[in-house]
Amino acid sequence: DVERTTCPPEKEVHEIDESLIFYKKRELEACVDAALLAAQMDRVDAIPFTYEQLDVLKHKLDELYPQGYPESVIRHLGHLFLKMSPEDIRKWNVTSLETLKALLKVSKGHEMSAQVATLIDRVVVGRGQLDKDTVDTLTAFCPGCLCSLSPERLSSVPPSVIGAVRPQDLDTCGPRQLDVLYPKARLAFQNMSGSEYFVKIRPFLGGAPTEDVKALSQQNVSMDLATFMKLRREAVLPLTVAEVQKLLGPHVEGLKVEEQHSPVRDWILKQRQDDLDTLGLGLQGGIPNGYLILDLSVREALS
């Protein structure tokens, strides 16, 4: 905590400049006027302050703007952004993509995922939706940051924007996020031909339902194992051995490598061993011949 003292007359601050790097923490606290600091924030990042000193400046801004900083200040935070907590950022209203770019550049490569996620969230809220310009900014300055957004925020993406999303932007997306993005992607790419469609839809397939996966198996797409492993477990389990064979094409041999991993393991347990044997891969764990399968979940649903 910063002690309160009065400012010595010779230390009075009339502008934010490099002389302030020689001020002790309590001198900064006593002598820097918060309103002056806010008005001249554009100078701060060019001055070689220590983070210890930046903490004092942050404290002054927090006192001046207890409800959250205005965008005129946020835009010029520079390395002071590294001192912000998600709780600080949650108070902001950010609409400018220039502000977003500036702060993404500062936070690049640092352990700031929570702060960056909160910042992006504030931008989406401030702009009203996740529009093409915002997506373009995220993909350019923060690959993977799209997946830091909640499914609720992602639901504001118009399908027309989906084309701007690159495969690597979805690498860290979870199933709930892909559940939201997949139908949008399907709509966005619906007029494309088979092979072109598959290339475009592939990164989103972690959100695809069984019927869509079944449809793909009829189109000779030769899905790679990495994509197959990212499919929803519920989408894979109802597939027959023949459908999986058609879906994967020459990549079907990869099932042996993934035999112990979900969703392959769970899918194997659902298949008749006879059917699995037709693949000639030595997959084990299917339902033995002569066993009757009762799906009790259906009976419970009817009663």
Partner: nanobody, 116 residues
Framework: QVQLVESGGGVVQPGGSLRLSCATS????????MGWFRQAPGEQRELVAR???????MYADSVKGRFTISRDNSKNTVLLQMNSLKPEDTAVYYC??????????WGQGTQVTVSS
């Protein structure tokens, strides 16, 4: 994490000189160059001199014309030549820098005492 080790402190009479050295254990990626700071008993740490990444030097008014900061890149060291020392220069002297991630780093300090 890069270690900073200061040396060269000691007891000196007013008007005397000392040369402080700060050795770094590796390459430093600093946002604001390297600085020499000092802390007198009961006082907060203050910056005395700084050398920026581009070689620009900056000095506190109280030491201008008496202290000189320099860098020897081949030896990964930052030097502080202190001339015309005064009793009010008595303090523990630290070298330090700020990374690009939000952290300040300091050495363990070296004591400088100016006394007759």
């Amino acid at each position: 994490q890069v270690q900073l080790v200061e040396s060269g402190g000691g007891v000196v009479q007013p008007g005397g000189s000392l040369r402080l050295s700060c050795a770094t254990s590796g390459t430093i990626f600093s946002r604001n160059g390297m600085g020499w700071f000092r802390q007198a008993p009961g006082e907060q740490r203050e910056l005395v001199a700084r050398i920026l990444n581009d070689g620009t030097t900056m000095y506190a008014d109280s030491v201008k014309g008496r202290f000189t900061i320099s860098r020897d890149n081949s030896k990964n060291t930052v030097l502080l030549q202190m001339n015309s020392l005064k009793p009010e220069d008595t303090a523990v002297y630290y070298c330090g820098y700020s990374d690009y991630r939000g952290t300040d780093y300091w050495g363990q300090g070296t004591q400088v005492t100016v006394s007759s």
